[in-house]
Amino acid sequence: SEVEYRAEVGQNAYLPCFYTPAAPGNLVPVCWGKGACPVFECGNVVLRTDERDVNYWTSRYWLNGDFRKGDVSLTIENVTLADSGIYCCRIQIPGIMNDEKFNLKLVIKPAKVTPAPTRQRDFTAAFPRMLTTRGHGPAETQTLGSLPDINLTQISTLANELRDSRLANDLRDSGATIRIG
């Protein structure tokens, strides 16, 4: 039920996860873990941010985007077959269990032996920050408890986080938007 994100051995892998802070400095803690999301927190943490900065990271895992603007997409450098599996992006919204959590499946393929170099995929096109949905209906709407300090407006993530599975199929390999009222 997870959308698959693919990379070849030796390449960098990209796992998209976004939210929109109320203000650039008003950040929400985020953790990335190897393995599907636990009930509480993140297990097997590979990277963590707090309200100000990245406060924990491990070799080969980094945030390439501007996390201060809510781009907490994970880049895994120089992947191997062992990097395959499910990863959890958990956006730790204040309040008891208000967290948004997303399971992303990474599939690593053996490197192709090709006679000529091929152009790498344009991830900017493949994973747009915002996505206006059409056809089957809106992205999933989730109502959270009052968030006086954060007032998040939207969290963006992968297509399988949509309630409408038909829409998810249409948006496979695209980012998707979840709006929080």
Epitope: E2, C37, P38, V39, N44, I86, N103, N160, R163
Partner: antibody, heavy 117, light 107 residues
Framework: QVQLVESGGGLVQPGGSLRLSCTAS????????MSWVRQAPGKGLEWVSA????????YYADSVKGRFTISRDNSKNTLYLQMNSLRAEDTAVYYC??????????WGQGTLVTVSS | DIVMTQSSSSLSASVGDRVTITCRAS??????LGWYQHKPGKAPNRLIY???SLQSGVPSRFSGSGSGTEFTLTISSLQPEDFATYYC?????????FGQGTKVEIK
């Protein structure tokens, strides 16, 4: 191999107190949140309480809030549940549970708590 | 709170039967759902996590499917050791809640 061993259950009178312990092995205890889940006789499973890996965050079911306190000692790989003001409806088998990838992945065998006069 | 409702509290089946247990959520929970097998006097055993991922060491006759509000646990060919009570657990938000359980009994 992950192992969770509960202890401390027993018979207690209504209004009394009991402290459950759970000793963990086979994984990096401090890296994972832990929970207590219970099953009353003839009933289903009910989540009771949880604590984050560092011990800084705690969570409780409404039915036990204000009466039960969860804690952990990462240096001893041990999880605790202090149960006060016990009621007959707290009678159950209490399971210690590891919160791993995808949810509650490993469970102990359980310890029976009986609240009766 | 989100309520989890399992299709039936008990069902009777024979060895070799294909058994399907359904769990419905009162609101969408994406894929934050697990399935557990529980036998009297034993620790519950996780079969499926993230709605469809098979727990390591669990026989392949068990499978999970679904997303959003409706989830299914399927036992493709029921074995004698599979007679037990099965629970779904959702954990997308606080508090994590179990379904009421489905007891699979010998017909």
């Amino acid at each position: 191999q992950v192992q969770l061993v509960e202890s401390g259950g027993g018979l207690v009178q209504p209004g009394g107190s009991l402290r459950l312990s759970c000793t963990a092995s086979g994984f990096t205890f401090s890296s994972y949140a832990m929970s207590w889940v219970r099953q009353a006789p003839g009933k289903g499973l009910e989540w009771v309480s949880a604590i984050g890996g560092s011990g800084g965050s705690t969570y409780y079911a409404d039915s036990v809030k204000g009466r039960f306190t969860i804690s952990r000692d990462n240096s001893k790989n041990t999880l605790y549940l202090q149960m006060n003001s016990l009621r007959a409806e707290d009678t159950a088998v209490y399971y210690c549970v590891k919160d791993g990838a995808g949810g509650f992945d490993y469970w102990g065998q359980g310890t029976l708590v009986t609240v009766s006069s | 709170d989100i309520v989890m409702t399992q299709s039936s509290s008990s069902l009777s089946a024979s060895v070799g039967d294909r058994v399907t247990i359904t769990c419905r959520a009162s609101q969408g929970i994406i894929n934050h759902l697990g399935w557990y097998q529980h036998k009297p006097g034993k620790a519950p055993n996780r079969l499926i996590y993230a709605a469809s991922s098979l727990q390591s060491g669990v026989p392949s006759r068990f499978s999970g499917s679904g997303s959003g509000t409706e989830f299914t646990l399927t036992i493709s060919s029921l074995q004698p050791e599979d007679f037990a009570t099965y629970y779904c657990l959702r954990h997308n938000s606080y508090p994590p809640t179990f379904g009421q359980g489905t007891k699979v009994e010998i017909k």
